[in-house]
Interface confidence: low
């Protein structure tokens, strides 16, 4: 059942979102979620996952990219991108990082 909390060993992850109580959290896995709401700049949230592991397998879209990993602080320096929306003939540019 994907809604059941994971019972495996916990990992320590970087926590960086408005919901964080401190710089790290502990969970079944670490997450980075990049979300862009209509008309807003993207927001990148780092934290811990315990539920809905199936989200980790989702493909990036132009609005969301969900990354998961399983080792100590593995989400600390991950930088995500959203799926490009330009026509296939155009090549996406780089952004300097």
């Amino acid at each position: 059942d994907p809604v059941k909390p994971s019972r495996g060993p916990l990992v320590t992850c970087t926590c960086e979102s408005p919901h964080c109580k401190g710089p790290t959290c502990r969970g079944a896995w670490c997450t980075v979620v990049l979300v862009r709401e209509e008309g807003r700049h993207p927001q990148e949230h780092r934290g811990c996952g315990n539920l809905h592991r199936e989200l980790c397998r989702g493909r990036p879209t132009e609005f969301v990219n969900h990354y998961c990993c399983d080792s100590h602080l593995c989400n600390h320096n991950v930088s995500l991108v959203l799926e490009a929306t330009q026509p296939p003939s155009e090549q996406p540019g780089t952004d300097g990082q």
């Epitope: 926590c15 710089p23 807003r40 700049h41 993207p42 990148e44 600390h76 952004d95 990082q97």
Partner: nanobody, 126 residues
Amino acid sequence: QVQLVESGGGLVQAGGSLRLSCAASGLTGNYYVMAWFRQIPGKEREFVSGISWSGNRADYADSVKGRFTISRDNAKRAVYLQMNSLKPEDTAVYYCASSAPGWDMLRRNSRDYSYWGQGTLVTVSS
């Protein structure tokens, strides 16, 4: 209206230290990436260091890694750059920059930053 004001620049001998400060006003909330860039006349503005909005993550240009340290104090709406072991090639005008609200990703491209200070001159003599 957003205003970024840098201070702490000056003349220092090679090997010395300086601490730059940037005071931000007009920013609502803390969800801004802050960064330092530098520029010498006739050259493009160059990324020095950036810090995520929680202060959890920092990024440094290779040329300053191990010598410079970025930090921020969200209560004071300030970002700092501690510069140690300064070299003559660090001479430049140093600019503080802030992302648009909600832009949480550390970036090295100046185009990703919406607000800029007027700059403070750092001169390192040999």
